[in-house]
């Protein structure tokens, strides 16, 4: 089937849209196949056999990662970007996606947020003037980059099922994930819902139908009662930190 080839596909950046936003109920027995509506891209870094995960935008990385060139100087070398570990509280940042979940980028520093202050992917307004030479702003990946919050602030955010290009296009509680024909807004995963955790072992394929990432305070971890299962079929669910 179409979905079965993606595991070995070398097409990492430009797969079609996201996973259908039907959103499974917590604890529902959802198939782990890449074709499920409850999917989304949780690409967490694993220490075993870690390899950089190529990306074109933040939404292709896990919720604890952001997409960037490995070093500022590397931006010109083919414009290669990979998923990098998010920056913790009080670390320097240039946009919200660089900060770890529960934080947002304020005046160039990752600050704690009581609620989800800004959607992933938006650029923090007060530092826009510093982004002229940002390597992400000129990634050349075919996706338009938003350069100011005000351009979007008066527009209605996409509801579930709305086509999007990044999670900042979607309403609160939704992320922009692939659903084959296009990326669409889908519900961020709740506790107990099946999530996708990618081990980086060489060849990677972006799912045709993605799940969103786990919501705030949750991590995509192996389900306790699935420890006996084979490595390839272990079921991951969103669990409290």
């Amino acid at each position: 089937t179409l979905n079965s080839v993606l595991i070995n596909s070398n097409a990492i950046k430009n797969l079609p849209p996201p996973l259908g936003g039907a959103g499974g109920q917590p604890g529902s027995a959802v198939s782990v196949a890449p074709g499920v509506l409850y999917e989304g891209g949780n690409k967490y870094q694993t220490l075993d056999n870690y390899q950089p995960y190529p990306c074109a935008e933040d939404e292709e990385c896990g919720s604890d990662e952001y997409c960037s060139s490995p070093s500022r100087g590397a931006a010109g070398v083919g414009g290669v970007q990979i998923c990098l570990a998010c920056r913790k509280r009080r670390k320097r940042c240039m946009r919200h996606a660089m900060c770890c979940p529960g934080n947002y980028c304020k005046n160039g520093i990752c600050m704690p947020s009581d609620h989800s202050h800004f959607p992933r992917g938006e650029i923090e307004e007060s530092i826009i003037e510093n982004l002229g030479n940002d390597h992400n702003a000129a990634a050349g990946d075919g996706y338009p980059r938003r350069t100011t919050l005000t351009s979007k602030i008066y527009h209605t955010k996409g509801q579930e099922g709305s086509v999007c290009l990044r999670s900042s296009d979607c309403a609160a509680g939704l992320c922009c994930a692939r659903h084959f024909w296009s990326k669409i807004c889908k519900p961020v995963l709740k506790e107990g819902q099946v999530c996708t955790k990618h081990k980086r072992k060489g060849s990677h394929g972006l799912e045709i139908f993605q799940r969103c990432y786990c919501g705030e305070g949750l991590a995509c971890r192996i389900q306790k009662d699935h420890h006996q299962a084979s490595n390839s079929s272990r079921l991951h669910t969103c669990q409290r930190h």
Epitope: T1, L2, N3, A11, N14, L15, P16, P17, G20, G21, A22, G23, G24, V30, S31, G35, V36, L37, Y38, G142, Y143, P144, E160, G161, V163, L165, H179, F180, W181, S182, I184, I208, F209
Partner: antibody, heavy 112, light 112 residues
Framework: QVQLLQSAAEVKKPGESLKISCKGS????????LHWVRQAPGQGLEWMGW????????NYAQNFQGRVTMTRDTSISAAYMELSSLRSDDTAVYYC?????WGRGTTVTVSS | QSVLTQPPSASGAPGQRVTISCTGS?????????VHWYQQLPGAAPKLLIY???NRPSGVPDRFSGSKSGTSASLAITGLQAEDEADYYC???????????FGTGTKVTVLG
């Protein structure tokens, strides 16, 4: 394997309504969106809209708004597309698709 | 009246290379939305040929390749074979129409 089984061909008169079905099997039906696409004889493909099989939410193409209704019954893994006020130019093959898999199509003829 | 324009026809002798263009605008292909290609054999439902601009699903020969640049996309068929004779459609999303759109379609004829 994934299959989308569509209802049989229909002949309708102008002004009547049409309701065709699409039954999914071999996958988790509520987990996907289903789209309807039609193709008039000798013409290209035209997207009509989608339905979220889990929530029932719909989104219709501008050309069909007010005339099309998409529903689903998750208990039998089926989706339905109803088109009202039929005209002769609605004569077409109507496909349901899960985006990566397509039904074989339902031929609809509208003639007086 | 499709917003994605394709040449009506293309042809080539067996073994030759044929390229089909799909021209859009800044509200569809140029906006960053993916392009997919379908092959439709006579009397059959569309079959996915290329997804996400340049990716081939399993079972599709590597003679088929897709690319995207700016506001247009193209499908290339190298080593043309008799069984490639079919209609080919590109597809994307259009933000100004808030809907999915298909190209006008291209009929590929294998000569000789």
């Amino acid at each position: 394997q994934v299959q989308l089984l569509q209802s049989a061909a229909e002949v309708k008169k102008p002004g009547e309504s049409l309701k065709i079905s699409c039954k999914g099997s071999g996958y988790d039906f509520p987990g996907y969106y289903l789209h309807w696409v039609r193709q008039a004889p000798g013409q290209g493909l035209e997207w009509m809209g989608w339905i979220n099989a889990n929530s029932g939410a719909t989104n219709y193409a501008q050309n069909f708004q007010g005339r099309v209704t998409m529903t689903r019954d998750t208990s039998i893994s089926a989706a339905y597309m109803e088109l009202s006020s039929l005209r002769s130019d609605d004569t077409a093959v109507y496909y349901c698709t899960r985006e990566d898999h397509w039904g074989r199509g339902t031929t609809v003829t509208v003639s007086s | 009246q499709s917003v994605l324009t394709q040449p009506p026809s293309a042809s080539g002798a067996p073994g030759q290379r044929v390229t089909i263009s799909c021209t859009g605008s800044s509200s569809n292909i140029g906006a960053g939305y993916d392009v997919h290609w379908y092959q439709q054999l006579p009397g059959a439902a569309p079959k996915l040929l290329i997804y996400g601009n340049s990716n081939r699903p399993s079972g599709v020969p590597d003679r088929f390749s897709g690319s995207k640049s700016g506001t247009s996309a193209s499908l290339a068929i190298t080593g043309l074979q008799a069984e490639d004779e079919a209609d080919y459609y590109c597809q994307s999303y259009d933000s100004s129409l808030s809907g999915y759109v298909f190209g006008t379609g291209t009929k590929v004829t294998v000569l000789g």
